[in-house]
């Protein structure tokens, strides 16, 4: 039975040209995290494998940095980066957990971080 929950940074906003950290955290389970995939809609951004380390998609390697931890740092943000991001946790023995983050990239300097929230 899957008992875990994914906590994410929730709805966040950032300035064009700036950077943002996408972060998820798996809690309420003793399952072992074997791999975390980061995706934007259906596009793979990066993989963090517990044994193999990071794979950053070549299309994003110039502006995506691994970490901190299992998170992902997006740099040189553009308005086109606005949208949904997903952290997909592969765990043993539970299986797969998915968290969602919505990022809005703003032209002006009024970007503020949204509140953290949980996805069961």
């Amino acid at each position: 039975m899957m008992t875990g929950t994914i906590e994410t940074t929730g709805n966040i906003s950032a300035e064009k040209g700036g950077s943002i950290i996408l972060q998820c955290h798996l809690s309420s389970t003793t399952a072992q995290v074997t791999q975390v995939n980061w995706e934007q809609q259906d596009q793979l951004l990066a993989i963090c494998n517990a044994d193999l380390g990071w794979h950053i998609s070549p299309s994003f390697k110039d502006r995506v940095a691994p970490g901190p931890g299992l998170g992902l740092t997006l740099q040189s943000l553009t308005v086109n980066d606005t949208g949904e991001y997903f952290c997909i946790y592969h765990t043993y023995p539970d299986g797969t957990y998915t968290g969602r983050i919505f990022l809005e990239v703003l032209e002006s300097s009024v970007a503020e971080h949204g509140a953290r929230f949980q996805i069961p």
Epitope: L44, N49, L52
Partner: antibody, heavy 119, light 107 residues
Framework: EVQLVQSGAEVKKPGASVKVSCKAS????????MHWVRQAPGQRLEWMGR????????KYNEKFKSRVTITVDKSASTAYMELSSLRSEDTAVYYC????????????WGQGTTVTVSS | DIQMTQSPSSLSASVGDRVTITCRVS??????LAWYQQKPGKSPKLLVY???TLAEGVPSRFSGSGSGTDFTLTISSLQPEDFATYYC?????????FGPGTKVDIK
Amino acid sequence: EVQLVQSGAEVKKPGASVKVSCKASGYTFTNYYMHWVRQAPGQRLEWMGRIDPDSGGSKYNEKFKSRVTITVDKSASTAYMELSSLRSEDTAVYYCAREGHYGFYSDYWGQGTTVTVSS
Amino acid sequence: DIQMTQSPSSLSASVGDRVTITCRVSENIYSYLAWYQQKPGKSPKLLVYNAKTLAEGVPSRFSGSGSGTDFTLTISSLQPEDFATYYCQHHYGNPLTFGPGTKVDIK
């Protein structure tokens, strides 16, 4: 066109070391991780390790960890695999292979370098 | 280490035949499986990754399926250039491991 061109065949004595090179062209070298895989005569493929040419960070198969070193020369778009303390069981074809877009598989392979270990 | 087995180890087939190769994995690897084709004296060539995604330039007669621990590579209509050895590989953990191969030769 993506190309991985490896150095020529080597004959080594037991206990010696070998360093195989892999020159990449046709793509941005630092954007793609590089793997090294070997194949002994009549055997299955055996993964040795991978490297991020951008950072130089590497991961190895535990079986080879004490004997293998994978490095890169970014300016020459070249990856290297050095295997030390050679024994007869290391006789194999050694391949470099570029990591794919979507994970830890390999989408392009070098032509292979035959390493023969014999006294 | 994750163990990979393939069946059959070899098979004889004719041009036009439908060929199916199976790969079994010792633990759940989700869909992180690749298939390669290798001809004698040549380097492996990627056919499929993520269990079912065809690599660039690979003919549509090749298809992959499966998830978890059981995977299949199918050649819908065998062509003369398809006679080769086929290897599966998981791309999920360290070490990455390959199956022992399935040799497809002419009947």
